[in-house]
């Protein structure tokens, strides 16, 4: 979280930014809020990228004001408008590319004053794993599956009975890249698993982390995915 | 869920003051504006002005300055109204409503002016 | 001060039957316009804010459109629920201005 403080003569207004990551291909959000104005007519959002000449975005006098967008993000950003009379100043960024990350100013000017934050936006890929039994396969198998991972990520396996076991002699991991020559699939397999147990497959690059888990008993099979962002920080 | 009380209805003199009161739960008390608006009967809804709870600063409708004073104890997670030299056209129900989109009312507090 | 002009002050319709009511700012407003309904013996209640933008739990019913100085609220089907008075409010600039008020009844 990172908060910060504008002067304007008397008055300074708190920005908040928290940091955060898009998914490339996917939409994203880069989160911003501030002391709200009571009036729409006198604030200005202004999101800055560092290294980049022209804005970002641009919404003052209750529109977008796009005539000094950079060429990189012309048509991809949108303020939530409906917010910004309520101090949300967050940009929604569509189609999130690799070149995206960096480090964004959220610069804010009400009737009470000015005020500015930074954020660091990193962008990657990351998806859910889905585990499952390979049926294929000579001795019971598990099979973790996740479509888009980027920078490449690590992969461990976990058991719930077995607790810090070493898995990596008995597992084998493989990256496949996809056809738009960034992302890769993951898949990693898990030789001579029991049953009644709970494996976990967990995937990890300096981005996101996910878990797969599968419990496998005589009578049933049963899944859990979890994914978490691992850089939301407020400033 | 975000609940506004205000206080009772109120009978007063010309020339005296009222002071309304606003109390609020459910949410985070001081991150936005509390307005206050006023419905004479029959009448269309007057914004009179609004207060920003954590700051305490204000903005007044013009009409009201130098007779309204909006205030704020945040301790009680309450905000207050205060109308002075009340004559007879400032009876009306007064409203309290929570930050600058009006997202929240509270019930509406009955002010009779009346010698 | 900006000034926010209704039309029609009231109205009569059918259930079913769909309902427009319009509001005019003096001057631009941007999309700086909510529309709230009020029910008698009741605090208004917020439906549309930013102009189109309807509020959490709003009926989707209820819809709002337009920009600079003209903007309209409409009720697809009109409900017997929906007898009530219909503001519109800027919120663009101060003070904070609302429209003389729609009453709706039912036919």
């Known amino acids: 979280l990172i908060i910060g403080f504008g002067i304007s003569g008397r008055h300074s207004i708190t920005v908040t930014t928290v940091a955060s990551a898009g998914n490339i291909g996917e939409d994203g959000i880069l989160s911003c809020t501030f002391e709200p104005d009571i009036k729409l007519s006198d604030i200005v959002i202004q999101w800055l990228k560092e290294g980049v000449l022209g804005l970002v975005h641009e919404f003052k006098e209750g529109k977008d004001e796009l005539s000094e967008q950079d060429e990189m993000f012309r048509g991809r950003t949108a303020v939530f408008a409906d917010q910004v009379i309520v101090g949300n100043a967050s940009l929604r960024l569509k189609n999130v590319q690799l070149t995206d990350a960096g480090t964004y100013k959220c610069y804010i000017i009400t009737s009470k004053g000015k005020g500015n934050a930074n954020l660091e936006y990193k962008t990657g890929a990351f998806s859910m794993p889905e585990v499952n039994v390979d049926y294929n396969a000579s001795s019971e198998t598990l099979r973790c599956e996740a479509p888009r991972w980027f920078p490449q990520p690590t992969v461990v396996w976990a058991s719930q009975v077995d607790q810090g076991a070493n898995f990596s002699e008995v597992s084998n991991t493989s990256f496949e890249l996809n056809s738009e020559n960034v992302t890769m699939k993951v898949v990693s397999v898990l030789y001579n698993v029991t049953i009644n147990n709970t494996y976990s497959c967990m995937i990890e690059n300096d981005i996101a982390k996910a878990t797969g888990d599968i419990k496998v008993t005589e009578s049933e099979i049963k899944r859990r995915s979890h994914l978490q962002l691992l850089n939301s920080k407020a400033s | 869920e975000v609940q506004l009380v205000q206080s009772g209805a109120e009978v007063k003199k010309p020339g005296a003051s009222v002071k309304v009161s606003c109390k609020a739960s459910?949410?985070?008390?001081?991150?936005?504006?509390m307005n206050w608006v006023r419905q004479a009967p029959g009448q269309r809804l007057e914004w009179m002005g609004g207060i920003y709870l954590n700051r305490g600063s204000s903005e007044y409708n013009e009409k009201f300055k130098g007779r309204v004073t909006l205030t704020v104890d945040t301790s009680a997670s309450t905000a207050y109204m205060e109308l002075s030299s009340l004559r007879s056209e400032d009876t009306a129900v007064y409203y309290c409503a929570r930050d600058s989109r009006f997202s929240y009312w509270g019930q509406g507090t009955l002010v009779t002016v009346s010698s | 001060d900006i000034q926010m002009t209704q039309s029609p002050s009231s109205l009569s319709a059918s259930v079913g039957d769909r309902v427009t009511i319009t509001c005019k700012a003096s001057?631009?407003?941007?999309?700086?316009v909510a529309w709230y309904q009020q029910k008698p013996g009741k605090a208004p209640k917020l439906l549309i804010s930013s102009a189109s933008y309807r509020y959490t739990g709003v009926p989707s019913r209820f819809s709002g459109s337009g920009s600079g100085t003209d903007f309209t609220f409409t009720i697809s089907s009109l409900q017997p629920e929906d007898i009530a008075t219909y503001y519109c409010?800027?919120?663009?600039?101060?003070?904070?201005?609302f429209g003389g008020g729609t009453k709706v009844e039912i036919k």
């Open positions: 409010q800027q919120h663009y600039n101060t003070p904070l201005t």
């Open positions: 459910g949410d985070t008390f001081t991150t936005y504006w």
């Open positions: 001057q631009d407003v941007s999309t700086a």
